[in-house]
């Protein structure tokens, strides 16, 4: 499970709004860090192991997911045709 935590820096000066969002994710046994619906998530470790990236549903709803060659990552294709590529190191 993940929750988005908003960190407010320098709250003593309300004019300066420097905010950053981080995810705090507590994964269950058999899960590790991944991406679901373009957000940090805990996913089945076997998805990562087998590099079946699209099985973790990394793209936004309505987008199409495709594996890159050699399973080095995935692409998310928007309905309009724009493609976002994510590579895994």
């Amino acid at each position: 499970t993940c929750e988005i935590v908003t960190l407010d820096r320098d709250s003593s000066q309300p004019r300066i709004e420097e905010r950053s969002q981080t995810a705090r994710c507590a994964c269950r046994k058999g899960q590790i860090a991944g991406t679901t619906r373009a957000r940090p998530a805990c996913v089945d470790a076997r998805i990562i192991k087998t590099k079946q990236w699209c099985d973790m549903l990394p793209c936004l709803e309505g987008e199409g997911c495709d594996l890159l060659i050699n399973r080095s990552g995935w692409t998310c294709t928007q309905p309009g045709g724009r493609i976002k590529t994510t590579t895994v190191s």
Partner: antibody, heavy 129, light 104 residues
């Protein structure tokens, strides 16, 4: 190189308590789940306890549940096992082990016994009166 | 509990296969030359091999059974091999009783 050094073993008395410490080096300690595994005389390996990379989750084997406490100090790169109400059957060699998966920042991750990639040399514990 | 054979034997140069079944998640294989002595991981996460382990060691997962293969076994490979994984409920780690490899 990844190194895990256990200490704290030795002769213990039944009903007493022991505290084992594992000092880690050569890797980003706070990113890895850690284990204690023991080998008792004439037996194989036995899962004792584990702790998540950030220390928020702990789990224990049935033989020590209720008697053991595992904890970690990510600043000092140490993991500790406290075992109370010692019994003769707790005699054995206690190993510290690392799970290979490197958990990224913002995540709390369990290790996996099948993903142990590094072991300490072990520390011997003898429970006897 | 995990199921693995209690012993196997082979001549130098032969191929040895040791199976382990009954667990969940991923499997690892751990070598021990004598009881209480240091443990060495030869395979982790089903088929990953540490960089200092010879390439003759390999692992493969099929269903819920993992097989450790030693291709061209050597005298130095004589040891007890323990498999490890999570129990079927995924609540705790579990190890096999160990397989003694004898190189004839």
């Amino acid at each position: 190189a990844v190194t895990l050094d256990e200490s704290g073993g030795g002769l213990q008395t039944p009903g007493g308590a022991l505290s084992l410490v594992c000092k880690a080096s050569g890797f980003t300690f706070s990113s890895h789940g850690m284990f204690w595994v023991r080998q008792t005389p004439g037996k194989g390996l036995e899962y004792v306890a584990e702790i998540t990379n950030d220390g928020s989750g702990t789990n224990y084997g049935s033989a020590v549940k209720g008697r053991a406490t595992i904890s970690r100090d990510n600043g000092q790169s140490t993991v500790r096992l406290q075992l109370n109400n010692l019994r003769a059957e707790d005699t054995g060699t206690y190993f510290c082990a690392r799970s290979t998966y490197e958990c990224p920042g913002g995540f709390s991750c369990w290790g996996d016994t099948g993903q142990i990639d590094a072991w300490g040399h072990g520390t011997e514990v003898i429970v006897s009166s | 509990a995990l199921t693995q054979p209690s012993s196997v034997s082979a001549n130098p140069g032969e191929t040895v296969k040791i199976t382990c079944s009954g667990g969940s998640y991923s499997y690892g294989w751990f070598q021990q030359k004598s009881p209480g002595s240091a443990l060495v991981t030869v395979i982790y996460w089903d088929d990953e091999r540490p960089s200092d382990i010879p390439s003759r060691f390999s692992g493969a997962l099929s269903g819920s059974t993992n097989t450790l293969t030693i291709t061209g076994v050597q005298a130095d490979d004589e040891a007890v091999y323990f498999c490890g994984t999570e129990d079927i409920s995924g609540t705790a780690g579990v190890f096999g009783a160990g397989t003694t490899l004898t190189v004839l």
